[in-house]
Amino acid sequence: RKAVLDCEAMKTNEFPSPCLDSKTKVVMKGQNVSMFCSHKNKSLQITYSLFRRKTHLGTQDGKGEPAIFNLSITEAHESGPYKCKAQVTSCSKYSRDFSFTIVDPVTSPVLNIMVIQTETDRHITLHCLSVNGSLPINYTFFENHVAISPAISKYDREPAEFNLTKKNPGEEEEYRCEAKNRLPNYATYSHPVTMPSTGGDSCPFCLK
């Protein structure tokens, strides 16, 4: 009788579809992820199964708590789609599909500087390029550890460019750039490039 009741409940909204989610939706190859399959009904003993496309990855029983499936994303096909099934006795419902976005991390960018020196000013052009990593890549330029540009998004493998004009300074300035894509908490920085102070013939980046 209980199985019949459960099945009848499923035909109403008393037993809705489970929800499949992960805290990390954007991942890089080799990353470990946890997938959570949960259900609104906290009183039933539910069997959760996880699938990717048409392969079965695992089964767990749960009551009140989400089932946690731990996976390692090592191949492109492991991005998904995933779905989970919640089953009570002979009745089951499926979640919506869930897919990860696999992103290659950015490599350390290279910063190039070009300077046009006038009597009073320096016209500085900064170029920053990360040769590896999934696009788009956001570049930010820094002077003495302070951001001097907005994030510049590049959807192609071309350097980001930022121009600035400075009064001929009396002290050294250090420039670097940051490259970041959709991978959360993963940014890389170029080696710093130091611009010497003015005085004498000390402008190694200047166009004469």
Partner: antibody, heavy 119, light 111 residues
Framework: EVQLVESGGGLVQPGGSLRLSCAAS????????ITWVRQAPGKCLEWIGT???????YYSTWAKGRFTISRDNSKNTVYLQMNSLRAEDTAVYYC?????????????WGQGTLVTVSS | IQMTQSPSSLSARVGDRVTITCQSS????????LSWYQQKPGKAPKLLIY???RLASGVPSRFSGSGSGTQFTLTISSLQPEDFATYYC????????????FGCGTKVTVL
């Protein structure tokens, strides 16, 4: 070249045991699923069981308990251990590879190995 | 789980349109976890159709598949001499564990 080669078949007495091997080349068992299928002389194809890329195993109702599938990743080989063999287990045994993430779309097959259970 | 294939055998001529059906006692996983195979005597089966209707690599376009849930069809639009063989369907299920089942085959012979 992607291929599967079965071995280990032969004549065995009723009640005996046999271990079949399925050697994979050209691909890794850590990515693909391997399924064992058998065919008695003049009869239908019959699903025995499957081992997926994660090492999870699945069996048909009749095979559970008597047949065991395992794998050795270092040898890139899958095994079918068959115990308590009966005359009705006489068949050609095939191993087959599924598509990535599709256990039972069997696109690569071995040549088969004949198992005869007779006294 | 029962996978019933019909007819069990049929005779046809070259150029004929041939239809084979597979009826499952319950729905396959995702409503389309079904594949079709061709087998010739003494040979291993060959994958023809997957996802119920998608043509496997290298399979001639005269083969097609259709259906969903519990009822599936394999059609050969114009039978060729090399098509005389036995055809099997294979369904994947998740109702009582992760499970597969073959139909018992349809033998296509020359009329």
């Amino acid at each position: 070249e992607v291929q599967l080669v079965e071995s280990g078949g032969g004549l065995v007495q009723p009640g005996g045991s046999l271990r079949l091997s399925c050697a994979a080349s050209g691909f890794s068992l850590t990515i693909y699923t391997i399924t064992w299928v058998r065919q008695a002389p003049g009869k239908c194809l019959e699903w025995i069981g499957t081992i997926n890329s994660y090492g999870n195993t699945y069996y048909s109702t009749w095979a559970k308990g008597r047949f065991t599938i395992s794998r050795d990743n270092s040898k890139n080989t899958v095994y079918l251990q068959m115990n308590s063999l009966r005359a009705e287990d006489t068949a050609v045994y095939y191993c087959a590879r599924g598509y990535v993430d599709s256990d039972w779309y069997l696109n690569i097959w071995g040549q088969g190995t004949l198992v005869t259970v007779s006294s | 789980i029962q996978m019933t294939q019909s007819p069990s055998s049929l005779s046809a001529r070259v150029g004929d349109r041939v239809t084979i059906t597979c009826q499952s006692s319950e729905s396959v996983y995702d409503n389309n976890y079904l594949s079709w195979y061709q087998q010739k005597p003494g040979k291993a089966p060959k994958l023809l159709i997957y996802d119920a209707s998608r043509l496997a690599s290298g399979v001639p376009s005269r083969f097609s598949g259709s259906g969903s849930g519990t009822q599936f069809t394999l059609t050969i639009s114009s039978l060729q001499p090399e098509d005389f063989a036995t055809y099997y369907c294979l369904g994947g299920y998740d109702s009582s564990g992760w499970y597969a089942a073959f139909g018992c085959g349809t033998k296509v012979t020359v009329l």
